[in-house]
Interface confidence: medium
């Protein structure tokens, strides 16, 4: 018979042969042969694999470093990674929760929509057209662009979400 060019779901092709993938929580020890099944072994105590796989090494569980304000929210299993969260009153700096902040700052181009409270983090919003923020701040809202017209000036440089407009004198036609 012709050797296969594709395999079923939860199988992989090796040496012109379809072998079973290892189930989540197990790693590959040896590929199948004509006569033997794929050999898999369970991941160790602090390891995991979360997909059907042919990995020869399991991944280490994430470490929730208390020096970064992290603690374990959900202990990892052989099939799932550890989930970290922040100590009481602190907030994750990202979805992955790799470090903690008392309250998050809004980057330039973003302003504070709602200042943090004891239970909720800072809420940021993008500065709309006509507004800017040039600082990283946990408190400052987007500021409106300077109105050159009210100062009897003209716009020399357009504003952005991160910079104010630059005003300059009007060009006066000489008589």
């Amino acid at each position: 018979p012709e050797p296969p060019t594709a395999c079923r779901e939860k199988q992989y092709l090796i040496n012109s042969q379809c072998c079973s993938l290892c189930q989540p929580g197990q790693k590959l020890v040896s590929d199948c042969t004509e006569f033997t099944e794929t050999e898999c072994l369970p991941c160790g105590e602090s390891e995991f694999l979360d997909t059907w796989n042919r990995e020869t090494h399991c991944h280490q569980h994430k470490y929730c470093d208390p020096n970064l304000g992290l603690r374990v929210q959900q202990k990892g299993t052989s099939e799932t990674d550890t989930i970290c969260t922040c100590e009481e009153g602190w907030h994750c700096t990202s979805e992955a929760c790799e470090s903690c902040v008392l309250h998050r700052s809004c980057s330039p181009g973003f302003g504070v929509k709602q200042i943090a409270t004891g239970v909720s983090d800072t809420i940021c919003e993008p500065c709309p057209v006509g507004f800017f923020s040039n600082v990283s701040s946990a408190f400052e809202k987007c500021h409106p662009w300077t109105s050159c017209e009210t100062k009897d000036l003209v716009v020399q440089q357009a504003g952005t979400n991160k910079t104010d407009v630059v005003c300059g004198p009007q060009d006066r036609l000489r008589a």
């Epitope: 602190w90 700096t93 470090s99 902040v101 600082v135 990283s136 946990a138 408190f139 400052e140």
Partner: nanobody, 116 residues
Framework: EVQLLESGGGLVQPGGSLRLSCAAS????????MQWVRRAPGKGLEWVSA????????YYADSVKGRFTISRDNSKNTLYLQMNSLRAEDTAVYYC?????????WGRGTLVTVSS
């Protein structure tokens, strides 16, 4: 190397006043929003007040609004916290902070005890 050194704490009676200072070095002071936070005995960290880099905008926790005043002198790289009408619940170690990341640069703090 970033350094923050708080001073001015001490024992004061309820209703009294204190002025805390924080001497900063190792970074461009006026570029940063600066903060005061405190930790009461056996409690978590509580944010107290913040001030913009240029010193024009100030922010306060509800618990200290109207009693505390934050200010800064960028020419001296120093942050201040004027505390008036002090109460027993203001007893805490006060820290100035450059940013509020858990592992970021914090001073060692200065202890304020409000007691009769």
């Amino acid at each position: 190397e970033v350094q923050l050194l708080e001073s001015g704490g001490g024992l004061v009676q309820p209703g009294g006043s204190l002025r805390l200072s924080c001497a900063a070095s190792g970074f461009t002071f006026e570029w940063y929003e600066m903060q005061w936070v405190r930790r009461a005995p056996g409690k978590g960290l509580e944010w107290v007040s913040a001030i913009s880099g240029d010193g024009y905008r100030t922010y306060y926790a509800d618990s200290v609004k109207g009693r505390f005043t934050i200010s800064r002198d960028n020419s001296k790289n120093t942050l201040y916290l004027q505390m008036n009408s002090l109460r027993a619940e203001d007893t805490a170690v006060y820290y100035c902070a450059k940013e509020l990341l858990f592992f970021d640069y914090w001073g060692r703090g200065t202890l304020v005890t409000v007691s009769s």
